[in-house]
């Protein structure tokens, strides 16, 4: 199935030019999407190509601008936040990035009546976290990790919380392991719906052990960085969450939510809090071991100013055969009665799907059933459900959003983007207005993307919001490779692989071959979605072969594959990536002398151990950033899908799956070890160690490290990286330079 | 016009069998959850079980689950309860309900069959 | 399984008088009541569902409140087709058991 599209016919093939390492680097070809920022039913914001905010009324066909460039510039303001009442917006500056999802900035509140910042009881700064209520114009922030509540923009702050410390006590905000493998925010707090109530979640990282490493700078000492980062099997993180009453903040202050018993009983994470109504709020809990997650709804007692939880209203969601959930359990959605709930979890048959649940979660009603699973559930209305799945036409690698009307029995079912632009589009998200009145559908290929704007009702689309015709126009006289989307059935496992094919290609002839992978589990590289980047520009002007394969702990395949990885990591995702290449050399067109391998974060661990696996198959590969042992990972990820490092528990297995443990077996590769010394996320202490056990096993092998780079190798340093990894395949591959 | 006649009470001896039906018209029968409910005479009304439309779902009153069993025959848009190993207790009128769907994911029970009488003597 | 307690059990008021009957839920059943209306020697007839959702044909005089575990069936200037049985039935899990009854005559 070729996915990609011809885009033009042109016979004058001499007119086409392959991609350039430089269009990658210089991001050439990179699209835009355009997801409106709703502030009604019918409204939306968007910031306009000269950075005008400019609202647009749907029904009415309007726009006006309600902030001027020359204010956003006045204050060098990158991001900006209406407030519900639309008196007020807030401006951001000074953005300065701390991990994947938090910063800090300077904000400024601009008064839209009289045009003019508000002055008086100004902002500190650097904050680093700050939200409008969702009615009327009171501010929360963090600062200096307490939290505080001003009424309206121009009053004194109250500081809610007192006990905030660097590294030690975190107030409304994660810390780094819940950052990134629990919240997936860089805020922990949450405005129950009229802004009468705020929750927020406190961390206490006093007893973490630190991960300490350099920061060389500029200057003539480096400094260290200091992070609260629990390992596997380490201190984790201790977390409380707590409400406030935003009216009265003083009478009674923050006030504790209980933690279910049976999750309290041992060591428990929060993984995240819905508000239903301004005086329910529903909160979810996970056990340290997380194949159990109990999600609690808890009621406002008028009377003692507390919250209750009671057990009747504790929901139990348990995996026998793997962890809880995908890579997050998934959250709930309430409906109108607020008190019932949709929630997607694994069916009897081990596909994920969205249940119906009103008394227990025994009792729910399955809404959605197949050998296929339902990935998002986007908004639930009086009639309406919209949900995103992978089953038209059975490709899990296609996202399509559909309708369930649940107003009338039996409920029906229509997918909405099913058929719309069906070459170009097969990988969709949405974004909805209040009420579903209106919403945008965003298309990410596999043609060049497109946003769209479509009646909540009826589904017809009213306009294109963005169609990338620039970047159509500018891959006209491009020879892009061929991209085909197919499935290998080896021994019942079902070997999803993208292959992206240089534009001449001729099957009779032989190519080298480069694997791209990631396997990490819940992860899915196959996608139907547009791309022109590196692997891109390696098949077009290299003439390489590349292919992505999803093999067993990938996700959207149902619980077989997903939990085939379960306490065994490091195992069945190389032994598929080695399936599927066998495969590909059966094919005919692979030459079998020259095939690489290459994968980033998890993606680094598989090729390393690929590499290291004594097949014979890679002449080559590249390990950028590659966890080396899962004694070094994040507690929350690796247990999820290792259990504990403790001899009654997995650490044999943690033992085994080490890419030093394999030292000797590179012996017979070309290796390329690549890893920043700032990385926050995947320590370079994994680099160093695999360096280290080669050494000593007196194995050759090439390394770069990224001075004061984190996990995401950017700026300068992604150049560097894509010039220094091309020269290193094309001389792997005996390709003239 | 809706309407739901039950069919085949009668005298039945302790311990006996007893099977009751329910004719349903006016309605699309197919789509609607269907329920039977007893009242003994000059008693308040009980709940004995529901059947959804496809016949996936049936759910019981905990103490009759194990002597009734309701089902349903859409073609001929009929509902059943069989009863087994009856008791005078058992004695009553028997009604069966049907209703309207109600957001979300609950029925109400809007129409009532007018009873048959179950007489359990020996 | 979650008892109904009625009442009052039986109750005597007069034409054009206000009347309240009360259920009450060993259990929170969050809104999912419905109030039948029974007459000597007829079928149940749905009055209310959702706690407070008069069904179709219902005169405006009946109105059903309450939340949690409390709810209450009020008929504002009773007229004389109004007595009768009646009784409350949750919806929130199975069994869906009803209320003891609430018998109302005339005075």
């Known amino acids: 199935i070729v996915l990609r599209p011809p885009r033009v016919h042109n016979s004058e093939e001499n007119t086409m030019r392959a991609l350039t390492l430089k269009d990658i680097l210089n991001g050439t070809f990179s699209y835009k999407t355009f997801f409106p920022n709703w502030i009604s039913g019918q409204e939306y914001l968007h910031q306009s190509a000269d950075n005008n905010i400019v609202l647009y009324n749907i029904e009415t066909g309007q726009s006006y601008t309600i902030l001027s460039n020359r204010t956003m510039k006045s204050v060098n303001a990158s991001n900006y936040g209406l407030s519900p009442d639309r008196q007020f917006v807030y401006l951001e500056s000074d953005y300065s990035k701390l991990w994947r999802y938090s910063y800090t900035a300077t904000y400024y509140i601009y008064d839209l009546s009289n045009g003019e910042f508000v002055r008086g009881n100004e902002l500190p700064r650097p904050i680093q976290y700050l939200c409008w209520s969702p009615v009327g114009s009171k501010l929360a922030y963090v600062y200096q990790n307490n939290i505080y509540l001003k009424q309206r923009p121009g009053d004194p702050p109250f500081q809610i919380t007192f006990n905030g410390r660097e590294n030690k006590i975190f107030n409304g905000i994660p810390d780094w392991v819940y950052e990134e493998e629990m919240l997936a925010t860089k805020y922990a707090l949450w405005w129950s719906p009229n802004g009468k109530f705020l929750a927020y979640a406190e961390f206490n990282d006093t007893d973490i052990p630190v991960i300490a490493y350099s920061y060389y700078g500029d200057e003539q000492y480096p400094r260290t960085i200091n992070i609260p980062y629990p390992k596997a099997g380490a201190k984790n993180p201790f977390v409380r969450i707590f409400i406030i009453d935003t009216t009265y903040p003083a009478y009674v202050g923050p006030q504790e939510v209980p933690v279910p018993a049976m999750i309290a009983s041992s060591d428990y994470y929060f993984s995240w809090l819905t508000w239903v109504t301004d005086e329910r709020v529903c909160l979810q809990w996970l056990k340290r071991v997380q194949n159990v997650s109990v999600l609690s709804i808890c009621d406002f007692r008028e009377d003692w100013q507390t919250w209750d939880c009671p057990k009747t209203q504790e929901h139990i969601e348990e995996s026998r055969t793997g962890w809880a959930g995908g890579f997050f359990v998934s959250t709930p959605v309430f409906s109108y009665d607020a008190i019932s709930y949709y929630k997607i979890f694994s069916d009897k048959d081990g596909y994920k799907h969205i249940h119906y649940i009103k008394d227990t979660v025994e009792n729910a009603i399955q809404i959605t059933s197949g050998k296929w699973e339902a990935i998002n559930i986007f908004r639930v209305t009086q009639d309406s459900l919209f949900y995103s799945s992978n089953e038209f036409e059975d490709y899990p690698g296609r996202r399509n959003i559909y309708r369930i009307s649940i107003g009338s029995y039996p409920p029906s079912k229509k997918c909405v983007t099913c058929h719309l632009r069906k070459e170009r589009c097969q990988y969709y998200t949405a974004s909805f207005s209040d009420y579903a009145k209106y919403y945008a559908l965003v298309c990410y290929g596999p043609g060049i993307p497109i946003s769209t704007l479509h009646d909540g009702r009826t589904d017809q689309e009213i306009k294109i919001l963005e169609e990338n015709k620039e970047l159509e126009n500018a891959l006209k006289n491009i020879q892009l490779p061929k991209e085909e989307i197919k499935k290998l059935e080896v021994d019942e496992i079902t070997l999803w692989y993208k292959m992206i094919l240089p534009p001449q290609f001729d099957r009779s002839k032989k190519y080298p071959l480069l694997i791209q992978v990631y396997g990490g589990p819940c992860s899915q590289s196959v996608r139907s979605v547009f791309a022109v980047n590196w692997i891109s520009y390696l098949a077009s002007k290299e003439g390489m072969v590349i292919a992505l394969v999803d093999g067993r702990g990938t996700a959207f395949q149902g619980d077989k594959l997903l939990y085939a990885v379960y306490r065994k990591l490091g195992v069945y995702e190389v032994e598929d990536q080695i399936t599927a290449v066998r495969k590909f050399i059966e094919m005919g067109f692979i030459d079998e002398k020259r095939i690489a391998i290459w994968g980033w974060s998890y993606g680094g661990y598989v090729s390393s151990l690929a590499l290291a696996s004594g097949t014979g198959l890679f002449k080559c590969g590249i390990a950028v950033a590659p966890v080396s042992s899962w004694e070094y990972y994040a507690s929350v990820y690796t247990e999820r899908f290792m259990g504990l490092p403790t001899k009654d528990d997995n650490l044999e297995h943690y033992k085994n799956s080490t890419v030093m443990a394999r030292a000797e077996y590179f012996r017979n590769v070309d290796y390329l070890l690549i890893h920043g010394t700032a990385d926050d996320n995947v320590h370079f202490q994994n680099s160093a160690q695999i360096a280290k056990a080669l050494v000593n096993a007196q194995v050759d092998f090439q390394a770069m490290w990224y001075s004061d780079q984190n996990h995401g190798l950017s700026g300068l340093s992604t150049n560097h990286l894509y010039t220094h990894m091309t020269h290193f395949l094309k001389q792997c591959f005996s390709l003239s330079d | 016009e809706v309407q739901l006649l039950e069919s085949g009470g009668g005298l039945v001896q302790p311990g006996g069998s007893l099977k009751l039906s329910c004719a349903a018209s006016?309605?699309?029968?197919?789509?609607?959850?269907m329920s039977w409910v007893r009242q003994a005479p000059g008693k308040g009304l009980e709940w004995i079980g529901e059947i959804n439309p496809d016949s996936s779902t049936i759910n019981y009153t905990p103490s009759l689950k194990d002597k009734f069993i309701i089902s349903r025959d859409n073609a001929k848009n009929t509902l059943y309860l069989q009863m087994s190993k009856v008791r005078s207790e058992d004695t009553a009128l028997y009604y069966c309900?049907?209703?309207?769907?109600?957001?979300?994911?609950?029925?109400?029970?809007?129409?009532w069959g007018q009873g048959t009488t179950v007489t359990v003597s020996s | 399984e979650l008892v109904m307690t009625q009442s009052p059990a039986s109750l005597s008021a007069s034409v054009g008088e206000t009347v309240t009957i009360t259920c009450r839920a060993s259990?929170?059943?969050?809104?999912?009541l419905a109030w039948y209306q029974q007459k000597q020697g007829k079928s149940p007839q749905l009055l209310v569902y959702n706690a407070k959702t008069l069904a179709d044909g219902v005169p405006s005089r009946f109105s059903g409140s309450g939340s949690g575990t409390q709810y209450s069936l009020k008929i504002n200037s009773l007229q004389p087709e109004d007595f009768g049985s009646y009784y409350c039935?949750?919806?929130?899990?199975?069994?869906?058991?009803f209320g003891g009854g609430t018998k109302l005559e005339i005075k």
């Open positions: 006016g309605f699309d029968f197919s789509r609607y959850w």
């Open positions: 259990g929170n059943i969050h809104n999912y």
């Open positions: 309900a049907g209703g309207y769907y109600r957001y979300p994911y609950y029925y109400t029970m809007d129409y």
């Open positions: 039935q949750h919806f929130w899990s199975t069994p869906y058991t």
